[in-house]
Interface confidence: low
């Protein structure tokens, strides 16, 4: 039985040209995290494998940085980066947990963070 829950940064916004940290946290389970996939709609952005570390998808390597922790940092944001992001936790023995984050990239100089986590 899957007992865990994923907390995420929820709906967040950031300014065009800036950076943002996407973070998820798996709680309420003792399952071992074997891999975390970060995806944007149907595209794989990055993988963090427990044994092998990080791999950034070649298409995003100039704008995506690993961390902090199991999170993902998006840089040089454009309006096209607006959309849903998913953290997919592969765990043993529970299976797969998925968290959703919606990012809105704003043209304006004022961007509010409606976040569960503190975003630097």
């Amino acid at each position: 039985m899957m007992t865990g829950t994923i907390e995420t940064t929820g709906n967040i916004s950031a300014e065009k040209g800036g950076s943002i940290i996407l973070q998820c946290h798996l709680s309420s389970t003792t399952a071992q995290v074997t891999q975390v996939n970060w995806e944007q709609q149907d595209q794989l952005l990055a993988i963090c494998n427990a044994d092998l570390g990080w791999h950034i998808s070649p298409s995003f390597k100039d704008r995506v940085a690993p961390g902090p922790g199991l999170g993902l940092t998006l840089q040089s944001l454009t309006v096209n980066d607006t959309g849903e992001y998913f953290c997919i936790y592969h765990t043993y023995p529970d299976g797969t947990y998925t968290g959703r984050i919606f990012l809105e990239v704003l043209e304006s100089s004022v961007a509010e963070h409606g976040a569960r986590f503190q975003i630097p």
């Epitope: 794989l44 993988i47 092998l52 791999h55 998808s57 070649p58 298409s59």
Partner: antibody, heavy 119, light 110 residues
Framework: EVQLLESGGGLVQPGGSLRLSCAAS????????MSWVRQAPGKGLEWVSA???????YDADSVKGRFTISRDNSKNTLYLQMNSLRDEDTAVYYC?????????????WGQGTTVTVSS | QSVLTQPPSASGTPGQRVTISCSGV????????VSWYQQLPGTAPKLLIY???QRPSGVPDRFSGSKSGTSASLAISGLQSEDEADYYC???????????FGGGTKLTVL
Amino acid sequence: EVQLLESGGGLVQPGGSLRLSCAASGFTFSSYAMSWVRQAPGKGLEWVSAIYFDGSIYDADSVKGRFTISRDNSKNTLYLQMNSLRDEDTAVYYCAKSHTVLQYGMDVWGQGTTVTVSS
Amino acid sequence: QSVLTQPPSASGTPGQRVTISCSGVTSNIRNSYVSWYQQLPGTAPKLLIYGNDQRPSGVPDRFSGSKSGTSASLAISGLQSEDEADYYCGTWDNTLNAWVFGGGTKLTVL
């Protein structure tokens, strides 16, 4: 069971073309980088080409401009279009699945298909 | 000429421990992960080690991998006759943007 099955090999004249296929089953094909690796008779392994989950492509210098790797995720199939074939392209061609991503190695291999370039 | 250098041959007697080396440069072995493949006569290669020292399920713990700087090695302990095969190291080269293999080592069990 994870399986890769190559097809399309055969005898072709120098300058000719062939298209190899690799049918994948038993895993989520679209999530993995895939490669073609070849082995000339009595020789070692030579990596030919790779395609990532996001469509990014990498080729060995020896085949650049002649070979084209592609994938059809809806058909769970990997392809290698080989043009302007040369004698030195004679080899067994293996399709290989990455271990998560290409950098971690290739964890599943097909049994290979033989390409012979000869006049 | 392979980008990664392996000895062409190695040998040992049953029960012995043998080590096969793989030498590269900063752009490949030092900055990437090394994997090892076993190819029995007439068959397709099989992954033995990935991520420098990780063993896939089903591979006996007699096989172990390690990496230091620009070199890597595969160790086989308790050598058995069925270990007679060709062994290849492989890694990603960040300068070539290409996967590279060693030339292969033919292991003979005496």
